[in-house]
């Protein structure tokens, strides 16, 4: 149950986290004027991946999309990059993993199966939380460093006569989206990847012995571990693993040539 | 198409109170007041956001004057305090329009600061 | 705040005369974000509201006459009235647009020669 449980958050938070990893891509908020000295200014400029915004005090907004790729700064391109293979990998691992789920059957798919894909999923997972953070600081970092950059530069002038105010930007809000969504896709991978774990069969140095009797089955599991009993209700064999913590959702998978001595 | 008409201006002693009215009909997005002392040049007076109610104000009006709005009745106002002679003029209520520019002004009122 | 000074502060013209007003701020009116200069020209006649002419130092309104132009970038614009018609005498009033407080030069009075 806790395997089931812990899987199932896993995807949710991943769901969500790459979600979100979408949103902040696609916003326009990645770097917004600081607003310093004038927190309520006529024209306030905002900038995205893929378009720059202006939005004026009579309600108008313009936005202007990037209409070049090669005019464009490398980190710019490399941040968009970044968050495009997030995306990508946060799609194919919600793809795996929804096929991994416990509480999802497909054909007669083996535990072990559905292990590997929920570790798949959670390793896609956790590189694409690694790829939006890493897309969004590298984002930050530029801001930073244009910003003191703006600041040392606050104001150019001819013979300090006129006056040109060079606009700074400061975080956006798509920076605090990205930031929290691939944290979030992080966990759930690292969460899917614990549950991978509980999924797993365990390979022991002994082998599970099922003993029939005219009845109930009852099958005995040597070194201590918990046995499984039937009492009339299962007329099929039931698998055993060495090791593998059983739920009731495995009653009616199919058997597999190791299960039997 | 946009409306707008202002009303409340008169004479008024210097040191009193006054308040000024725009009926506003059509889309709206900020307004603002600009006023004009006889023979004098267009001054800029206060602006508000018509949804959120920011305001923002020119310095030599902040604390004496307050514009605000009324959603219901869609009218503009100017509650103008501490009268003084030199805030004798038209005040206009004007909308703002792309690029920051005034583009529907009202017909103006008068107000006379004397004693 | 940004201060607009315009010149000439007052001009004679005849009809069909080439009028030039030139109007000049403080600070720059180019915004980064769009490359737009946030300056507003306007013509006011006796006793009316003043009327939007340009916008974004070159945009026109629509609605006025094509012989109105404006440009500019910066700190120094111009108003051009290409061909001056009856109708045109009047105050013209430049405007900062960009940061506020709005601020609007002194006014030039374009009269009849």
């Known amino acids: 149950m806790a395997v089931t449980a812990c899987q199932g958050l896993g995807f949710v938070v991943s769901l969500i986290g790459i979600a979100g990893i979408i949103a902040a891509t696609c916003m326009d908020q990645w770097s917004t004027q600081d607003l310093y000295n004038n927190p309520v200014t006529a024209v306030f400029n905002y900038q995205g991946l893929w378009r720059s915004c202006v939005r004026e005090s009579s309600g108008f907004t313009e936005c202007r999309g990037y209409f070049t790729l090669l005019g464009l700064p490398a980190m710019l391109q490399a941040v968009r990059a970044l968050m495009i293979v997030g995306i990508v990998l946060g799609a194919i691992g919600l793809l795996v993993s929804i096929f991994a789920l416990k509480c999802i059957r497909i054909g007669s798919m083996e535990d072990s199966a559905k292990a590997n894909m929920t570790l798949t999923s959670g390793i896609m997972f956790i590189v694409s939380g690694l790829c939006a953070i890493a897309g969004v600081s590298v984002f930050a970092n530029m801001l930073v460093t244009n910003f003191w950059m703006s600041t040392a530069n606050m104001y150019t002038g001819m013979g300090g006569m006129v006056q040109t105010v060079q606009t700074r930007y400061t975080f956006g809000a798509a920076l605090f989206v990205g930031w929290v969504a691939g944290g979030l896709t992080l966990i759930g991978g690292v969460m899917m990847c614990i549950a991978c774990r509980g999924l797993a069969p365990e390979e022991t140095n002994y082998k599970a012995v099922s003993y029939h009797a005219s009845g109930h089955s009852v099958a005995y599991k040597p070194g201590g571990f918990k046995a499984s009993t039937g009492f009339g209700s299962n007329t099929k064999n039931k698998k055993i693993y060495d090791g593998g913590a059983r739920t009731e959702d495995e009653v009616q998978s199919y058997p597999s040539k190791h299960d039997y001595v | 198409e946009v409306q707008l008409v202002e009303s409340g201006g008169g004479l008024v002693q210097p040191g009193g109170s006054l308040r000024l009215s725009c009926a506003v009909s059509g889309y709206t997005f900020s307004m603002n007041w600009v006023r004009q002392a006889p023979g004098k040049g267009l001054e800029w007076v206060a602006w508000?956001?018509?949804?959120?109610?920011?305001?923002t104000y020119a310095d030599d009006f902040k604390g004496r004057f307050t514009i605000s709005r009324d959603d219901s009745k869609n009218t503009l106002y100017l509650q103008m305090n501490s009268l003084r002679a030199e805030d004798t003029a038209v005040y206009y209520c004007?909308?703002?329009?792309?690029?920051?520019?005034?583009?529907?002004w009202g017909q103006g009122t008068l107000v006379t600061v004397s004693s | 705040d940004i201060q607009m000074t315009q010149s000439p502060s007052s001009l004679s013209a005849s009809v069909g005369d080439r009028v030039t007003i030139t109007c000049k701020s403080s600070?720059?009116?180019?915004?980064?974000?769009?490359?737009?200069?946030?300056l507003t020209w306007y013509q006011q006649k006796p006793g009316k509201a003043p009327k939007l002419l340009i916008y974004?130092?070159?945009t026109l309104e629509s609605g006025v006459p094509s012989r109105f132009s404006g440009s500019g970038s910066g700190t120094d614009y111009t108003l051009t009235i290409s061909s001056l018609q009856p109708e045109d005498f009047a105050t013209y009033y430049c405007q900062n647009a960009y940061s506020f407080p709005f601020t609007f030069g002194q006014g030039t009075k374009v009269e009849i020669k």
């Open positions: 508000i956001n018509m949804y959120t109610g920011e305001p």
């Open positions: 600070q720059s009116l180019l915004n980064s974000g769009n490359q737009k200069s946030y």
């Open positions: 974004w130092a070159s």
């Open positions: 004007a909308r703002l329009a792309r690029g920051n520019g005034f583009d529907y």
